[in-house]
């Protein structure tokens, strides 16, 4: 089971959207729905995302990256990893810089996974760029 | 198939070169040519690579940092995974952070993996702190 | 082999405490001792872990991220991946970002892994925000 | 010295299309983030769109977005605004103007072009 | 989006007089603000970045003050070529101009 999923530029909600066939894109063994992975098989997997944040002019607003699993048994999303961002530009300048999160969970059948983050303007969608993969150990 | 690169501080040109065999370096079942790890076998791997970045006065210059794959069957560089950093530090002050890059792939035959860098000069090559690898999953 | 150990907010000394039970933390196959993971198997490991810094009023004090591996057969630590901040907030703001390192070692029995950070005060030891594993290729 | 010249204003039915450029000199283009900014007869100024250094990323004012698209060829020195769907509130002076080291103000300006919607 | 309010519209002055333009932000913008002079027919030309800090090979009759929500530039003795309109504009977040203010011959 393994996915890479890349960014789309169409997103316009939250959680993100993601491009699960063209170019660098891949996934099998796991199902891709509404901006989410699936899991088919329960085990322990390698959840990774990169998100790059990007705007014309700093004003330093927090930024947010999370990945978070949901499943119908739960009634809350689970935090798997998130990283905040505050103060780290200087204010009237174009900046840039990304977010990488990756770690071992262990998943369910049934548990979907999602990336979660705070301003979608701010983000630049290019399959190099931003992305959300995993693979079973 | 697995690697672990370690900077290589006689880089002098991009792409960077890199350590293979002392230190933590490693390398199996993949080559190392000129600055790239040649694919032996297709198949998925996770690709990962770390460059720190420091200088003695910032000037907020752009930081760029690339993994990339070129195969003689295509004309033209397909860039895997990027970072850009712009406006990130305070200007005429020492300064220092890394740029982190891991992800899922679908390597073929004879591509050849390359870390590309904006500025040679700015990067610290310890092996502890820049560092390019891959391991087929 | 595989483990994911959470943040340990009754963390009082360097190296970092961990939590190797609760939430999504997971271990099998290497032992947790004092702060360490404890290799039990000869082999290549996938080793990353990401620490979440963030303080009240910035003063751009040196932050420093190090995965480092201890053997009885060697006096001296072995770092494997390090990272070093400096210069990367304004002064007297609230600030907060992540570092994260992740690459492939060929560690042996017996080897004990710590994470060493700057700063303990510096650090948020949420689950999701700061975290240390492995998996065994 | 630094020259920005803007060409390809001119005379424009409502909903067609118009393409500008702006031919650059006297400095390194690839370094240097260039904006568009437009000033309707008798009025103040408008900003409108920017273009990163490298091409890599875009940002438009509300007022134009999904209409305008701005692009570059750091190898010709030139940059363009690609106007579609034009409509009468378009018709202004357009300028291209280069930003100062990445922050979002001017320190050069070209002469300007008319861009003139109207049936 | 930060609004941008100058005034006076407009100001009648005499060659030697000392002026002041004001620009108010709707919302605190530090001290991330330009001044440009633009001429008839012409492009704008920079003057000034920061609030307060003169571009080079402006003359130093021109000067800006201010941070937070207001902001002036100052002409200490106006010469013939100063007649001209002059817009602020901030650059906090996004790009905004104020309105203009046009200076005259009185």
């Known amino acids: 089971s393994v996915a890479h999923l890349t960014g789309n530029p169409h997103s316009r909600s939250i959680p993100l959207e993601w491009e699960d066939t063209y170019g660098t894109a891949l996934i099998s063994g796991v199902k891709y729905k509404k901006g989410g992975l699936v899991i088919n098989e329960t085990g322990l997997y390698f959840v990774y995302s990169k998100v790059y944040f990007r705007g014309q002019s700093c004003n330093n607003q927090p930024l947010n990256h999370k990945v978070y699993m949901r499943n119908s048994k739960y009634p809350e999303d689970l935090v798997l990893m998130e990283e905040k961002r505050l103060n780290y530009c200087t204010t009237g300048q174009i900046w840039a810089h990304s977010s990488y999160l990756g770690a071992v969970f262990n998943l369910t059948s049934a548990d979907h996974l999602y990336v979660n983050i705070s301003q979608l303007s701010l983000i630049n969608f290019e399959e190099s760029k931003t992305f959300f993969g995993l693979y079973k150990l | 198939s697995v690697a672990h690169l370690t900077g290589n501080p006689h880089s002098r040109s991009i792409p960077l070169e890199w350590e293979d065999t002392y230190g933590t370096a490693l390398i199996s079942g993949v080559k190392y040519k000129k600055g790239g790890l040649v694919i032996n076998e297709t198949g998925l791997y996770f690709v990962y690579s770390k460059v720190y970045f420091r200088g003695q006065s910032c000037n907020n210059q752009p930081l760029n940092h690339k993994v990339y794959m070129r195969n003689s069957k295509y004309p033209e560089d397909l860039v895997l995974m990027e970072e850009k950093r712009l406006n990130y530090c305070t200007t005429g002050q020492i300064w220092a952070h890394s740029s982190y890059l891991g992800a899922v792939f679908n390597l073929t035959s004879a591509d050849h993996l390359y870390v590309n860098i904006s500025q040679l000069s700015l990067i610290n090559f310890e092996e502890s702190k820049t560092f390019f690898g891959l391991y087929k999953l | 082999s595989v483990a994911h150990l959470t943040g340990n907010p009754h963390s009082r000394s360097i190296p970092l405490e961990w939590e190797d039970t609760y939430g999504t933390a997971l271990i099998s196959g290497v032992k947790y001792k004092k702060g360490g993971l404890v290799i039990n198997e000869t082999g290549l490991y996938f080793v990353y872990s990401k620490v979440y810094f963030r303080g009240q009023s910035c003063n751009n004090q040196p932050l420093n991220h190090k995965v480092y591996m201890r053997n009885s057969k060697y006096p001296e630590d072995l770092v494997l991946m390090e990272e070093k901040r400096l210069n990367y907030c304004t002064t007297g703001q609230i600030w907060a970002h992540s570092s994260y390192l992740g690459a492939v070692f060929n560690l042996t029995s017996a080897d004990h892994l710590y994470v060493n950070i700057s700063q303990l005060s510096l650090i948020n030891f949420e689950e999701s925000k700061t975290f240390f594993g492995l998996y065994k290729l | 010295q630094v020259q920005l010249v803007e060409s390809g204003g001119g005379v424009v039915q409502p909903g067609r299309s118009l393409r500008l450029s702006c031919a650059a000199s006297?400095?390194?283009?690839?370094?240097?983030?260039i904006h568009w900014v437009r000033q309707a007869p008798g009025k103040g100024l408008e900003w409108v769109a920017v273009?990163?250094?490298?091409?890599?990323?875009?940002f438009y004012a509300d007022s134009v977005k999904g209409r305008f698209t701005i692009s570059r060829d750091n190898s010709k020195n030139t940059l363009y605004l690609q106007m579609n769907s034009l409509r009468a509130e378009d018709t202004a002076v357009y300028y291209c103007?280069?930003?100062?080291?990445?922050?979002?103000?001017?320190?050069?300006w070209g002469q300007g072009t008319l861009v003139t919607v109207s049936s | 989006d930060i609004q941008m309010t100058q005034s006076p519209s407009t100001l009648s002055a005499s060659v030697g007089d000392r002026v002041t333009i004001t620009c108010r932000a709707s919302?605190?913008?530090?001290?991330?603000l330009a001044w440009y002079q633009q001429k008839p027919g012409k492009a704008p030309k920079f003057l000034i970045y920061?609030?307060?800090s003169l571009e080079s090979g402006v003359p130093s009759r021109f000067s800006g003050s201010g941070s937070g929500t207001e902001f002036t530039l100052t002409i200490s003795s106006l010469q013939p070529d100063d007649f001209a309109t002059y817009y602020c504009?901030?650059?906090?977040?996004?790009?905004?101009f104020g309105q203009g203010t046009r200076l005259e011959i009185k």
């Open positions: 920061q609030a307060s």
């Open positions: 103007a280069r930003d100062r080291d990445n922050w979002n103000y001017f320190d050069y």
């Open positions: 006297g400095f390194t283009f690839s370094t240097y983030g």
């Open positions: 273009i990163w250094y490298d091409g890599s990323d875009k």
């Open positions: 919302q605190s913008i530090s001290s991330w």
């Open positions: 504009q901030q650059y906090n977040s996004y790009i905004t």
